[in-house]
Interface confidence: low
């Protein structure tokens, strides 16, 4: 639904003539006619099939219009649709004599006709006013139209019926192209949904109304993220409702028993480590160089002849040092120094001596890596597959195994829209983000180059005199429409002046 | 007036060749496109060729792809369908057809031309 | 390949309506046209692109297509209008016919 509007500004009739070439008499009082109908390639009479209008009398001769909108005027003129726009039009304005007070067309005598023009073409809906003058050898009028929608009435074609609502069913203004824009705090389809408090949690919380938030049973706090421990818990929490987990050092249903001995008491000595095993037991880790139940006694790490192999051992001050004989290393002279001799490389690995055969390398076989090759190559920890890939590890080697839309070895293609030709008649297809595009060759249009396209008889611009060209498609000929005071088949005679004009 | 006119129709035995021709007038003949359909004797209508208004584009049927040849002389005013191979199953009416413009289908056809393949 | 579907045979009385339906995958997004053979004759152009008509063919000839079906309507059937009636479309490979439907006037 919506409005076509034209603007009547200017008509000029010098000479005050009808279109029959007679004078009016004082004047022309002059008053418009406007026929509003489907576009037709020649415009021709019959039903104003999107409506019509008539002014009152505007002036005499020569006159400009008045804007009326402000006042309630009715200029511009008003041609309401109830329809869905269909973007064309033909549009006819005839400029009336009205001898007396009697604008009705049975009131006025035929010859009362001062002058009409007919146009046709493309309009879009929008607030842009289109500006048009039109001459004829005797008369000019000036006038602007446009189309615009009518209230709640949006889109290209004011098809989209949309009302701002504020309620149960939704909370929403209309945006010009007629989608729904929500209310602040609102979302959803229809804008029905409340937008709860920022961070309130999804499954645990919820809202009736904007930057609310309410919480289900078993959890609290003000985004709804705190669950509540059993009705009665002490000294303990939860990570889900109604459960009891204890403190360190509290025990029992209700951890109201308390098990830290160690805070309570400090019974180990020396920097020890203090650990609860059960109600009123506990255990101590000692320091290196104590010993005893609470680490009570100081005792020489080196008793315990911690080196091997012959190392000799001494005592520091937060523990030992072993120094090792030649051939042996290691933090208790454990390891020996080995060679190729020793076969050293597992899993198949090659053995390289270096440095005159005083140490040694490994070459690990696919898929085993380490000093030794001890340790199997796990080929998914680089993450190989592109776009959301996922790694499988198949013996030796790994796959990629891809999202829909995706192929190649990582996964790093894209599955080609235009794989299948789908452009017809040679066209080029272009691979787009979010589908294709076919490029037609001459003689073809449509979206996939499907329609065939002919030779336009009207492209040479045959036709004289600023006259209309169309094409006769069954015949592929032109037809010249002249413009008032031009005849001929291609307009190129003009039309001699009636004998009975005064001067 | 629109018109079009085929002749070379015949009697041709299997394997044998016939040139079909198309004389068009009353109408732009190098602008449009161009087509040839077929009807075997109390059968429907089969589409056999088509050829765009300046000759580059020709499709075929798949029943006569590799046999059947379109082409046209625009100075000519003409159409013509280059018959090889021809099989007992290629008996039919042949009629020349102008295409519209823009998918309009067949608006202007000829009277049609006998083809018989018998041996 | 693409294949239109047509009813072989419609009988209806004189001053009465006619449907004759074409059927295939989609066919609403294809373009549809009609025409007309009456015996002995070449095909008439009735409609094309879906439901227009060219000049010289009368009013009550009128045609639609959506979904999967493309319908001919003959509205007051006169006995001239007996005759085979195609219903055609363009596909990849090239244009398809219709196999064709026998429109008896009773």
């Known amino acids: 639904s919506g409005v076509f509007q034209l603007q009547l500004q200017e008509f000029i009739n010098e000479r005050g003539v009808l279109a029959s070439g007679r004078p009016c008499e004082p004047g022309c009082r002059t008053f418009f006619r406007v026929c509003l109908k489907h576009f037709q390639a020649v415009v021709s009479p019959g039903p104003c099939t999107f409506g019509t209008v008539s002014t009152p009398v505007l002036g005499t001769n020569s006159f400009a219009v008045r804007d009326d909108s402000s006042g309630g005027g009715r200029n511009p003129l008003q041609l309401p649709f109830n329809f869905t726009w269909p973007g064309t039009f033909s549009l006819i304005i005839e400029a009336w004599h009205a001898p007396g007070d009697d604008l009705r067309p049975e009131a006025l005598p035929p010859d009362a006709l001062i002058s009409k023009i007919a146009i046709q073409g493309s309009l879009a809906v929008g607030q842009n006013w289109l500006l048009d003058e039109q001459t004829s050898t005797l008369t000019r009028l000036r006038y602007s139209y446009r189309v615009i929608c009518s209230d709640n009435y949006y889109g290209d074609n004011c098809s989209r019926l949309c009302k701002k609502r504020n309620d149960h069913f939704g909370h929403y203004v209309c945006q010009p192209d007629g989608n729904l824009s929500c209310l602040p705090g609102w979302t959803g389809e229809y804008c029905q949904q409340p937008i709860c408090l920022s961070g309130c949690h999804e499954q645990n919380g919820y809202c009736s109304k904007p930057a609310e938030c309410l919480c289900r049973p078993g959890w609290q706090g003000r985004l709804c993220n705190e669950c509540i421990p059993h009705n009665g818990c002490r000294h303990g929490t939860c990570s889900t409702p109604w459960q009891c987990t204890c403190d360190e050092g509290w025990g029992g249903l209700f951890c109201d028993q308390d098990l830290n001995y160690c805070t309570h008491h400090s019974p180990c000595k020396n920097g020890a480590t203090c650990s609860n095993s059960g109600q009123r037991s506990y255990t101590c880790t000692c320091r290196p160089g104590y010993t005893g139940v609470d680490c009570e006694l100081e005792l020489s790490e080196c008793d315990s002849n911690p080196c091997r192999n012959g190392g000799s051992c001494k005592d520091q001050e937060d523990g030992y040092h072993c120094l090792c004989p030649p051939g042996y290393y290691g933090l208790h002279c454990e390891h020996s120094t080995l060679s190729c001799a020793d076969s050293p490389c597992f899993n198949g690995g090659s053995c390289r001596e270096r440095n005159q055969g005083a140490n040694y390398a490994c070459e690990c076989p696919p898929n085993f890596t380490g000093s030794n090759c001890e340790k199997k190559v796990d080929r998914c920890t680089s993450n190989p597959c592109a776009n959301g890939g996922q790694c499988l590890n198949r013996g030796p080697s790994r796959m990629c195994r891809c999202r829909p839309g995706f192929t190649g070895t990582y996964c790093e293609l894209h599955v080609s829209d235009c794989a299948r030709n789908p452009c017809a008649h040679g066209g080029t297809c272009h691979d787009l983000e979010n589908g294709l595009m076919c490029t037609c060759p001459a003689g073809f249009s449509g979206r996939r180059c499907e329609v065939r396209t002919s030779i336009d008889a009207c492209a040479s611009s045959p036709c004289f005199n600023r006259a209309t060209c169309y094409t006769d498609l069954s015949t592929d000929t032109f037809v010249c429409n002249c413009p008032y005071g031009f005849v001929g088949s291609r307009c190129e005679f003009p039309v001699g002046l009636p004998p009975s004009f005064p001067w | 007036e629109v018109q079009l006119v085929e002749s070379g129709g015949g009697v041709v035995q299997p394997g044998g060749s016939l040139r079909l021709s198309c004389a068009a007038s009353?109408?732009?003949?190098?602008?449009?496109?161009m087509s040839w359909v077929r009807q075997a004797p109390g059968k429907g209508l089969e589409w056999v060729a088509d050829i765009s208004s300046d000759g580059r584009y020709k499709y075929y049927a798949d029943s006569v792809k590799g046999r059947f040849t379109i082409s046209r002389d625009n100075s000519k005013n003409t159409l013509y369908l280059q018959l090889n191979s021809l099989r007992a199953e290629d008996t039919a009416v042949y009629y020349c057809?102008?295409?519209?413009?823009?998918?309009?289908?067949?608006?202007?056809w000829g009277q049609g031309t006998m083809v018989t393949v018998s041996s | 390949s693409y294949e239109l579907t047509q009813p072989p045979s419609v009988s209806v009385s004189p001053g009465q309506t006619a449907s004759i339906t074409c059927s295939a995958d989609n066919l609403g997004n294809q373009y549809v046209s009609w025409y007309q053979q009456k015996p002995g004759q070449s095909p008439v152009l009735v409609i094309y692109q879906d439901g227009m008509r060219p000049s010289g063919i009368p009013e009550r000839f009128s045609g639609s297509n959506s979904g999967n079906t493309a319908t001919l309507t003959i509205s007051g059937t006169q006995a001239m209008d007996e005759a085979d009636y195609y219903c055609?479309?363009?596909?990849?490979?090239?244009?398809?016919f219709g196999g064709g439907t026998k429109l008896t006037v009773l």
């Open positions: 057809a102008k295409a519209g413009g823009g998918n309009v289908g067949f608006d202007i």
């Open positions: 055609q479309a363009w596909d990849w490979s090239g244009e398809v």
């Open positions: 009353g109408f732009t003949f190098g602008n449009h496109w």
